[in-house]
């Protein structure tokens, strides 16, 4: 049998037997542009990739459409994939999404939803989610139905006050919604009453900026 | 586009108690605060209170602690203040109104106000 | 509470001709953000008010551009660049920082 060398996510690199959480290159589907991802392989059985870190404000999130279409940042440490590399990798198969979440108190939390996809750049990468489980809140802390992302140079928002500028980083900004963990990074004893934080309503309410998130994504059927 | 259409105008006696509607069409209702100003005749707006629907939490402008009650129904997007012992300095337009953006975002400012209620307190 | 202090209480005014009114507030409006959190209203008469300016400086939906919001902290101002006939009525200014939200006093802009 020949081994494969080319990876669509994290989950066909753990079933072709590397299963070190670490920093992978993954292909486009249908293509052979590349990317590099974190991998984790540790939670949850692995085969998880990472799509969105956040864990010490090293990295600046408020940035344009096309830096949140392409990604940014280091896989390492703080990033964000891409949303055309996420858009076609979840319009192909079905995803779960799983948000893991850090507060400064030393709580975790998660969010687990069975389907997830990003629509395509024509829909502004409009998320949509179903089937929320998870000990981060019942209700979604992402609006449903879902949003169109927005950046400070692209406003797809429900909102005249143009939520991204507002409150900071791409998103997938209701008006503004009840989340937003892609904004302003605030250290412990400055994360309370900011409206521009790292924000997961239904867990720790609205101006409480957490500490650490990511947001991975895997085969439901993995 | 979103629209708050009141109830009509109401003539009370001191001591009693006023309910006023607040029907929100053409858009999002339980995750925006419904706020309520009033307008004494010849005076300035005075904030009273809010409500959120989508949580059932209101709260209230010291001055009219304990006189008022905010109040939402999801079902119908419709709210509703209710103010108790009456007396004539509460004769006023009694408007609701709502912010841009959502409560997870801010107290906010209102961009949608309804076309006001009439409450004249008189014996 | 924050306390909102508006001036002048009256502004006679000429066509065409600019105006300004002034608020102040009793605490800062900035957000860490860097949003001011000030809105202001024109209340016409006989009609309910309507959001002219928010976030300290940003016009709202259909609100001509000789309208403007500028200042930052505890001091804001709005301008009309030239006074039109149907800008009359009281203006407003709102903080919306915190609960509960406060108005100012409010200033009668009327033609001369």
């Known amino acids: 049998k020949e081994e494969q060398t080319t990876f669509r996510d994290c989950a066909e690199i753990f079933k072709s037997g590397l299963t070190t959480s670490g920093i992978y290159t993954l292909t486009f589907p249908n293509s052979t542009e590349e990317i590099k991802a974190y991998c984790d392989m540790d939670v949850g059985g692995g085969g998880w990739t990472v799509i969105q870190h956040r864990e010490d404000g090293s990295v600046d999130f408020q940035r344009t459409w096309k830096e949140y279409k392409e990604g940014f940042g280091s896989p390492l440490g703080e990033y964000w994939l891409g949303n055309e590399f996420v858009s076609q990798l979840t319009g192909q198969h079905r995803y779960v999404l799983k948000i893991q979440l850090k507060d400064w108190e030393g709580n975790e939390a998660h969010s687990l939803y069975d389907h997830f996809y990003l629509a395509g750049e024509e829909s502004n990468y409009r998320i949509h989610l179903t089937g929320l489980t998870g000990t981060a809140g019942k209700i979604s802390s992402i609006s449903q139905p879902g949003s169109d992302f927005s950046t400070k140079d692209s406003d797809n928002d429900k909102c005249i006050c143009k939520c991204s500028q507002m409150l900071s980083g791409g998103w997938w900004f209701d008006a503004c919604g009840p989340s937003n963990l892609n904004g302003q990074y605030y250290p412990q004893k400055q994360n309370t009453n900011k409206f521009n934080g790292i924000k997961w309503y239904y867990w720790k309410g609205s101006g409480y900026s957490l500490k650490a998130t990511t947001m991975m994504i895997r085969p439901a059927d993995f | 586009q979103v629209q708050l259409v009141q109830s009509g105008a109401e003539v009370k006696k001191p001591g009693s108690s006023v309910k006023v509607s607040c029907k929100a069409s053409?858009?999002?209702?339980?995750?925006?605060?419904i706020s309520w100003v009033r307008q004494a005749p010849g005076q300035g707006l005075e904030w009273m209170g809010r409500?959120?629907?989508?949580?059932?939490?209101?709260n209230y402008a010291q001055k009219f602690q304990g006189r008022v009650t905010i109040t939402a129904d999801k079902s119908t997007s419709t709210a509703y203040m209710e103010l108790s012992s009456l007396r004539s300095e509460d004769t006023a337009v009694y408007y609701c109104?709502?912010?841009?953006?959502?409560?997870?975002?801010?107290?906010?400012?209102?961009?949608?106000w309804g076309q006001g209620t009439t409450v004249t307190v008189s014996s | 509470d924050i306390v909102m202090t508006q001036s002048p209480l009256s502004l006679p005014v000429t066509p065409g001709e600019p105006a300004s009114i002034s608020c102040r507030s009793s605490?800062?409006?900035?957000?860490?953000?860097?949003?001011?959190?000030l809105d202001w209203y024109l209340q016409k008469p006989g009609q309910s008010p309507q959001l002219l300016i928010y976030?300290?400086?940003n016009r709202a939906s259909g609100v001509p551009d000789r309208f403007s919001g500028s200042g930052s902290g505890t001091d804001f101002t709005l301008k009309i660049s030239r006074v039109e006939a149907e800008d009359v009525g009281v203006y407003y200014c709102?903080?919306?920082?915190?609960?509960?939200?406060?108005f100012g006093g409010g200033t009668k802009v009327e033609i001369k």
């Open positions: 976030l300290g400086s």
């Open positions: 109104a709502r912010p841009y953006y959502d409560f997870w975002s801010g107290p906010g400012g209102m961009d949608v």
């Open positions: 409500i959120i629907p989508i949580l059932g939490i209101a």
């Open positions: 709102m903080q919306a920082l915190q609960t509960p939200l406060t």
């Open positions: 053409g858009g999002t209702f339980s995750s925006y605060a």
């Open positions: 605490q800062s409006l900035l957000h860490s953000n860097g949003y001011n959190y």
